[in-house]
């Protein structure tokens, strides 16, 4: 039982939450809160929006983003792409891991121009020590942040 | 290997399913089936809609709700909020953990009467012994129950 | 720590990815890539679209499917059902585990006839040795495959 408890206490896990600073508008990945409120890191590191593996293995990684808008203006992307991507020294480009495409703007009704939608991703991927996972949303202008409960990013070793 | 098997058998986990009694209309959280069919509790307790931690640690908690309706009349909620909330003796109010807002009524097309939508939430949170997690949906009238496979609530320690 | 590492290395887990051969049109379950790219099997087997348990216990199973289309043609189902189903020697028919119904066609807007939607399912179920889990989508003609990142199927023991 001591062994079992130790196993859980050491098992890499993290839950990062959305914050006002999450959306940079720079074309980079979303940034996250790592310490305040519900956010934590246990056996994983964080760097510029990325969860960084300290231990090689299979991880269940997940992210949710809250989307919202008013109406469906023509200049706004009709398709939203929300994805988890891996950065590794072995490749020069980010590698797509888990991706969703949605057309949330179609949520607006004749009765209400305000629409809300949510995108959830989760799946098991292999990470080597030092490999990183980031979240990207295109168009990130439609991501709605509030208090860290609606948009988040996490992982745990399986 | 004996140790590994024991570890899994003792790892807290639960999966609760939607039932006819889930929707109370009282403003309280959704209630759940804990024993029949696919539902089970292992190392977690249940009380009035809440999963209760018996062991402190990080848990991946999740919930899915099936939403559905006929048409999109003005009097019906245009925004649905589906959330997981923590109850703890340390605070008088429930604490939002994971929340989604959706505008499912926009799923109905100009011709199509019946619309369906689904909301999934999952993430890692810390629970102390005795702390509780509940599911709330506003407006719960749009939750569609059938056989426990479409609306559910679960957790496991990570 | 040696024990802890061994535990993780032996913990059953899998992530299967969508491929061009996933959609058979035969009325059977979706088929999956098990080795290439992000796909892997560890302590679980695969057979004709099914993840097969080698070890009895509780598993978190999940699937995501990417849906997409152009407009809402009359001949197409207005409701999509995405589900995870169990096959067991103890019953002649598949057992529904986790199911979602969505009306994605309502995503098409006045500005854009192309629509995208995503359905995610995840939950904990018990599997005996030899029991199988498959993914079904009705109408599977709306599933959009690309590179294994948008539609996938996985599991790990909890």
């Amino acid at each position: 039982l001591i062994q079992e408890r130790r196993s859980h206490q050491n098992n890499p896990a993290a839950h990062l939450t959305g914050a006002n600073s999450s959306l940079t508008g720079s074309g980079g990945p979303l940034l996250w809160e790592t310490q305040l409120g519900l956010a934590f890191l246990r056996g994983l590191d964080y760097h510029d929006g990325a969860l960084v593996a300290n231990k090689a293995g299979y991880y269940y990684i997940y992210s949710k983003v809250q989307l919202g808008g008013v109406g469906c203006p023509l200049g706004l992307a009709s398709t939203i792409t929300h994805g988890l991507y891996k950065r590794t020294p072995r490749y020069p480009e980010e590698l797509e891991l888990l991706v969703s495409q949605q057309s949330p703007c179609g949520r607006a009704t004749s009765n209400s121009r305000v629409w809300w939608d949510s995108s959830f991703l989760g799946g098991v991927v292999h990470l080597e020590v030092g490999e990183e996972v980031v979240v990207r949303v295109l168009d990130e202008r439609l991501v709605r942040l509030r208090d860290g409960t609606r948009s988040y990013f996490g992982a745990f070793m399986v | 290997l004996i140790q590994e098997r024991r570890s899994h058998q003792n790892n807290p986990a639960a999966h609760l399913t939607g039932a006819n009694s889930s929707l109370t209309g009282s403003g309280g959280p959704l209630l759940w089936e804990t024993q029949l069919g696919l539902a089970f509790l292992r190392g977690l307790d249940y009380h009035d809609g809440a999963l209760v931690a018996n062991k402190a640690g990080y848990y991946y908690i999740y919930s899915k709700v099936q939403l559905g309706g006929v048409g999109c009349p003005l009097g019906l909620a245009s925004t649905i909020t589906h959330g997981l909330y923590k109850r703890t003796p340390r605070y008088p109010e429930e604490l939002e953990l994971l929340v989604s807002q959706q505008s499912p009524c926009g799923r109905a097309t100009s011709n199509s009467r019946v619309w369906w939508d689904s909301s999934f939430l999952g993430g890692v949170v810390h629970l102390e012994v005795g702390e509780e997690v509940v599911v709330r949906v506003l407006d719960e009238r749009l939750v569609r129950l059938r056989d426990g496979t479409r609306s559910y609530f679960g957790a496991f320690m990570v | 720590l040696i024990q802890e590492r061994r535990s993780h290395q032996n913990n059953p887990a899998a992530h299967l990815t969508g491929a061009n051969s996933s959609l058979t049109g035969s009325g059977g379950p979706l088929l999956w890539e098990t080795q290439l790219g992000l796909a892997f099997l560890r302590g679980l087997d695969y057979h004709d679209g099914a993840l097969v348990a080698n070890k009895a216990g509780y598993y978190y199973i999940y699937s995501k499917v990417q849906l997409g289309g152009v407009g809402c043609p009359l001949g197409l189902a207005s409701t999509i059902t995405h589900g995870l189903y169990k096959r067991t020697p103890r019953y002649p028919e598949e057992l529904e585990l986790l199911v979602s119904q969505q009306s994605p066609c309502g995503r098409a807007t006045s500005n854009s006839r192309v629509w995208w939607d995503s359905s995610f399912l995840g939950g904990v179920v018990h599997l005996e040795v030899g029991e199988e889990v498959v993914v079904r989508v009705l109408d599977e003609r709306l599933v959009r495959l690309r590179d294994g990142t948008r539609s996938y199927f996985g599991a790990f023991m909890v």
Partner: antibody
Framework: QVQLQESGPGLVKPSGTLSLTCAVS?????????WNWVRQPPGKGLEWIGE???????NCNPSLKSRVTISVDKSKNQFSLKMNSVTAADTAVYYC???????????????WGQGTTVTVSS | DIQMTQSPSSLSASVGDRVSITCQAS??????LNWYQQKPGKAPKLLIY???NLETGVPSRFSGSGSGTDFTFTISSLQPEDIATYYC?????????FGGGTKVEIK
């Protein structure tokens, strides 16, 4: 249980306006149900006219839409049908009926009035 | 509009017979189909909703099946009180549309 009762003139002149009211008793019109009008010409089948929700949201059969107005009066717990420019082809038994709930996913017309016969003739 | 084609338009059967009526939709309507019974001079009565679910209080000799475009309504053992016209109705799309009806008579 909920009961419906249609009322209105049984005879309308061609090019005139047909006006019918449906009184809801045993329940509130402000429930999440849709409230419908259906008609049946003599010796023929059923034709859906339209529906209304207590908030005033309506849907009408496109074949009749330009001539039909459906309204609701929550204070009187009733809803009404007006059809203008009527012709002999509008002669029928008119039924009011309760449809499925907006917060539901089946749409059976489960409660019907007894029907009222409207004849269009000069 | 979705066209609902009912057949036969009329039938005659003996008491105790099994009677079946079919309804075909012009496009896929999933299971969004209802069946009604209308007796002479009366309002229609809902018997079956969602293609196969029996409305409360309706005798179990009535049943429905089908999905997509093809649906069947069955009376397992025809009774004298079942003399009526039966209608199918779809609610997948607006406008709601009914089949032309099937008149059931006793031989």
């Amino acid at each position: 249980q909920v009961q419906l009762q249609e009322s209105g003139p049984g005879l309308v002149k061609p090019s005139g306006t047909l006006s019918l009211t449906c009184a809801v008793s045993g329940g509130s019109i402000s429930s999440t149900h849709w409230w419908n009008w259906v008609r049946q010409p003599p010796g023929k089948g059923l034709e859906w006219i339209g529906e209304i929700y207590h908030s005033g949201s309506t849907n009408c059969n496109p074949s009749l839409k330009s001539r039909v107005t459906i309204s609701v009066d929550k204070s009187k717990n009733q809803f009404s049908l007006k059809m203008n420019s009527v012709t002999a082809a509008d002669t029928a038994v008119y039924y009011c009926t309760r449809g499925g709930a907006a917060a539901g996913t089946n749409y059976g017309l489960d409660v019907w009035g007894q029907g009222t016969t409207v004849t269009v003739s000069s | 509009d979705i066209q609902m084609t009912q057949s036969p338009s009329s039938l005659s059967a003996s008491v105790g017979d099994r009677v079946s009526i079919t309804c075909q939709a012009s496009q896929d309507i999933s299971n969004y189909l209802n069946w009604y019974q209308q007796k002479p001079g009366k309002a229609p009565k809902l018997l079956i909703y969602d293609a196969s679910n029996l409305e409360t209080g309706v005798p179990s000799r009535f049943s429905g099946s089908g999905s997509g475009t093809d649906f069947t309504f069955t009376i397992s053992s025809l009774q004298p009180e079942d003399i009526a016209t039966y209608y199918c109705q779809q609610y997948d799309n607006l406008p709601l549309t009914f089949g032309g009806g099937t008149k059931v008579e006793i031989k």
